[in-house]
Every structure is written in C-alpha cells, then in structure tokens.
Interface confidence: low
C-alpha cells in the first residue's frame, strides 16, 4: 500500500499544524501575559507591595515624582503625632511635662501648614518636643489600643531630616506613606519574559461579592495578612479582631468558585513589626488556644496553619506561603522571584507546555 | 458610694471673684480626670474647665480662658475653679464630674448635685 | 470646634411609646459619642457611653447606636421616670462638646 497523500490530505495535514501552530503561540502568550489581583484587609501592605513593583521593575521613582509625595510624608507624620495626642487623652495619659500641653495645642494651630508641602521650623519644632515627650512615648507604646500609621516612629524619629527646607522623600520615604487606595488601581511591568498586570483592588469597598467575578480567570492572587494586627484591641465599630476579619476575607477568596483554576500566594506581611510585637504581646491575645512559646519561628508557623487551614481543597489546591517585610524592597525582591518562578510552572502547566 | 459635693456658689457683682469647691469621695480621686460643666438658666449643658491627675495639665474653655483657673489637692480630695472678672453671662449651676476612660472612651459618670452662681448687680 | 446638632428639640410621647431622639456631629467622631438625662433641679445622669455600651445600672429599655457623624438614642417603651432632657457629648476631640437638649414631654 503507497504512502503518498493526496493533494486534499496534504491540506488537512497543513491545516492540523497550522492549528496546532497556533495554539501553541497562543498558550505561549496566554502564558506571557499574568494577572495578579491583590487582596487583604485594610492596612495590609497590598499598596506598598505596588510600590516594591515601581521600585523593583520599573526603575522607580523620579526625583519629580518623590517631590510630589513631600506632602503626603508632612500629613503623614502630622496625623501619626495627632493621633497620638489624641489618644493620650482616652487613654489618660498626662504629658512628662506640662508644657507639652501647650505644644499639642499649638499643634493643632499649625499642622494646617503642612498641606501645602511646607513644614515650617516652629511646627517641627513643637512636634519634636511632643515625641521626645515621656507620656507620648508611653501612650505610643500602648498603640495596639488606637489606631497609629505603622510609619509614625519612622518619620518621628527622623525629623530632623524630613523638615529641612530642601527635602526630598527617598524611595524608602516613598515606600512609607500612608494614601487610603480608592477604586482599581493597575499596574503593569514586565519580568522574566513575562508581562504582569497587577490590580490592587484595596480602595473597591463595595459589596466584594458583586464584583469578584469580575476577576475570574487571573493567574494568581496575592493575599496580604498584617501578622501585626494579631494584637490590636478592638474598635468599637469593628464586629471581629482584624487578624480574624482577614481569615474570614481569606476563607471567602481561596475557597472561591471563581478561582478554583487560581494560584493562591499568601504574605504573611509585615514580619519585622511581629518579631518585636510577639516579644511583648502574646499570641493569646488573639488566639486563646494557643499553647506554643511566644517566639517569632513558632508563633509565625501558628498564624501560618490557621490561614492554610482554612483551604477546603488541600489535595487540588496548594496555598504559596512566604513572610514578607513590603517595606524591604530586597525581601520583596527575592519573594517576587520566587512566586514568579511558581506562576511559570503552573502557567506552564495549564498550557500544556510543562 | 462616689460622691462629689460641690460648694462656693452664690450671688456676686459682675467683675468680682469667686471659688467653686468640689469635694470628691468614695474613689481614687488623685488618678481621676474631673471637668466643670455649667448650665445657664433654661439653657443646655456647657464644658468649662478639666484637669488631668498625675501632672494636672489644665484645659479650658475660650469663653473663660485667663479668667477661671481649675486646681485640684489630692490631699484633700478637692477640686476648685477660681472665677474671676466674672461677667453676667457667667451666670448658671456649675457641676463637677468625674471623668472616666473604659476601653479607651471617656465619658462623665458621676456629677455633683451643683452649685449656682449669679453674676449680677 | 465640633457643633453636635440635636433634633427634636422637643417632642411629646405617652408611656408605652417608642421614641428615638438624633444626634448629628458636625465632623466625624468615629463612635466617640456619650448620651446623659438631666430631670428638672437634678445633675445630668449617664445613659449610654461609647454610642451603644449601656451604663451599669440603666434600664434596657434605653439603647444607642450610630457610628460616624450621625447617632440614636433609643427609648423602647417610655416609662413615667423616661420624661427628661436628653443630651449628646462628643468625647472625640478637645474640647468637648453637648447637643443643646431634646426635652421630651408627656403627651
């Protein structure tokens, strides 16, 4: 019997590699392009981890765009100082010195200053004598009870250089600022070969639920958990501790209908703030049943179980768990590398390329 | 039982002087916040003065700031309010109360019966 | 200085009734916000603290709620004693500030 095909087989035989062909270069872009949709309470680090992106993708930020952010580290650092007064008071806690009380009222008088970008050496003044203050810094140790910008003591203790008249944020000042997040906001970057766009939905407070969907389909999600808010009282407005509102976020995400195809990247944020919290604080505070030491290693692995836990599909889904510092761009760094590696392979995979 | 008994009240000419006492027992007076409160004929309640324990940093009203002083002796368990340059519109019952901070919110839980002070000639 | 703004100002119910009296903060105040009865001749009396904590020894009858700028104070079935002025205080910032009273009078 011959081998040789036909004129109309040799056209269907083209045909199939030419389909094939395609596929292929569509998986291969499918696979090139990455959808990362951030999530997490409040206060979690998820912008701070957009910045790291700007930082670390995308050469950074300009010497006009730092200039820009001089406004943000004054309010920054005036609301950090105010809250604390402010707190003295519901907490009843006196000034060392009485003429403080004269300082916080003058405060009050000149922070309006600071908006326009401006910090003027008598408002700098006066909030350094505030910090330097023995009951500030008695009543900023007890801020587990109030709400406080983790950035108050970075900008506090470095006065000096922040209210120079020729100061321009660094990136790392840049890194510490506080912006409430409104809407979407996207960012795009490319890295090993790979084009990412990442969204940060932090600012949608909308009802989640009409909305998530929007998302079905996205490479992976990062999940950011401030391991610091295991401590923090509860205010008045909030039904539950903030460690376990983001449990009950996390649950909701990772046992999503929605992304049952999604790769689910955990931070475990802001270790460098529990390392020094767990040494004062025990984990009881938020978890009663815990019986270990008070140690960062087995405390962190604690809070790190009770997220996992919470995945209801152990054997088809991995959770990928990494402790992060969002403010180290070289942790950030090295934890990025890692999750993209994870994205390739599992991006691999599902195009059938692995 | 937290009892505050206030005292000093009375008739007195518009630019006279007078001091209000307020005599606190049945709680750890010294690690106590305590305000001044007055209340104008028919009219609603107005903060005057508080002072904090430890340090006794002062707080004030604008309508009687470097007229009235707020002062405490925790040895006697007493909080006072020196009124000076009083002026018609000073007139009310003033009360002392405690305040008190629970769960980092504070609020007024105990007031004196008050004392009433007439400024008029 | 925060303006705490009451409305009514008066209102006339009978024993038995319902009745929620306002309280509006002229900036947020977060749940900050302090509820007291003052009876003709007498001190004024805490009700309610921190918006909603019931003060030890007040009839459940009363209860608050709100969280922000705007605030409700809530008496379920008025009782004879209930007839009173009602005041808000704002506990959030210096200085410290009351509503002007609701007086609430038997119908």
């Known amino acids: 019997m011959g081998c040789t095909l036909s004129a109309e087989d040799k056209a269907a035989v083209e045909r199939s590699k030419m389909i094939d062909r395609n596929l292929r270069e569509d998986g291969e872009k499918a696979a090139k392009e990455v959808k990362l949709l951030l999530l997490g309470a409040g206060e979690s680090g998820k912008s701070t981890i957009v910045k790291q992106m700007k930082i670390i993708h995308e050469d950074g930020y300009s010497e006009d765009e730092c200039k820009q952010y001089k406004v943000v580290v004054y309010s920054n650092t005036i609301q950090s100082i105010i809250a604390i007064i402010r707190a003295m008071g519901r907490l009843k806690i006196d000034f060392g010195e009485a003429a403080r009380a004269d300082d916080a009222r003058q405060l009050f008088v000149l922070a309006g200053s600071a908006e326009e970008g401006v910090m003027t050496p008598e408002l700098a003044g006066v909030i350094k004598r505030l910090w330097r203050d023995g009951g500030v810094q008695a009543c900023f140790s007890r801020s587990r009870e109030y709400q406080l910008n983790d950035s108050a003591s970075y900008y506090l203790n470095d006065l000096d250089r922040i209210s120079q008249s020729n100061y321009i944020p660094t990136q790392q000042d840049v890194l510490r600022t506080r912006v409430k997040t409104t809407g979407i906001v996207e960012t795009h970057f490319t890295f090993k070969d790979l084009y990412f766009k990442m969204f940060d939905v932090g600012g949608q407070r909308s009802e989640r639920k009409k909305w998530i969907h929007c998302f079905e389909g996205v490479t992976a999600i990062i999940f950011c958990v401030a391991l610091s808010d295991y401590d923090l009282v509860l205010a008045e407005d909030e039904e539950m501790n903030r460690m376990h509102e983001s449990m009950k976020l996390f649950d909701s995400i990772c046992n999503n209908k929605w992304f049952t195809e999604t790769s689910i990247i955990l931070f475990l944020n802001k270790k460098d703030l529990f390392e020094e919290k767990i040494k004062r604080s025990p984990l009881t505070i938020c978890y009663p049943e815990y019986t270990g030491s008070n140690t960062y290693e087995e405390a962190a692995a604690y809070i790190q179980c009770q997220f996992e836990d919470l995945n209801r599909r152990k054997d088809t889904k991995e959770i990928y768990t990494h402790f992060t510092c969002a403010t180290d761009t070289k942790n950030v760094q090295f934890v990025f590398d890692a999750v993209t590696d994870v994205i390739i392979k599992n991006n691999l995979k599902e195009c059938g390329l692995y | 039982e937290v009892q505050l008994l206030e005292s000093g009240g009375g008739l007195v000419q518009p630019g006279g002087s007078l001091r209000l006492s307020c005599a606190a027992s049945?709680?750890?007076?010294?690690?106590?916040?305590m305000y001044w409160v007055r209340q104008a004929p028919g009219k609603g309640l107005e903060w005057v003065s508080s002072?904090?324990?430890?340090?006794?940093?002062?707080y004030y009203a604008d309508s009687v700031k470097g007229r009235f002083t707020i002062s405490r002796d925790n040895s006697k368990n007493t909080l006072y309010l020196q009124m000076n340059s009083l002026r018609a519109e000073d007139t009310a019952v003033y009360y002392c109360?405690?305040?008190?901070?629970?769960?980092?919110?504070?609020?007024?839980?105990?007031w004196g019966q008050g004392t009433l002070v007439t400024v008029s000639s | 200085d925060i303006q705490m703004t009451q409305s009514p100002s008066s209102l006339s119910a009978s024993v038995g009734d319902r009745v929620t009296i306002t309280c509006r903060a002229s900036?947020?105040?977060?749940?900050?916000l302090n509820w007291y009865q003052q009876k003709p001749g007498k001190a004024p009396k805490l009700l309610i603290y921190?918006?909603?904590s019931l003060q030890s020894g007040v009839p459940s009858r009363f209860s608050g709620s709100g969280s922000g700028t705007d605030f409700t104070l809530t008496i379920s079935s008025l009782q004879p004693e209930d007839f009173a002025t009602y005041y808000c205080?704002?506990?959030?910032?210096?200085?410290?500030?009351f509503g002007q009273g609701t007086k609430l009078e038997i119908k």
């Open positions: 109360a405690r305040d008190v901070s629970h769960g980092g919110h504070s609020f007024l839980d105990y």
């Open positions: 049945g709680f750890t007076f010294s690690s106590s916040y």
């Open positions: 002072i904090s324990s430890g340090y006794s940093s002062t």
């Open positions: 900036q947020s105040i977060s749940s900050y």
């Open positions: 921190a918006a909603s």
């Open positions: 205080q704002q506990a959030d910032y210096y200085p410290p500030t």
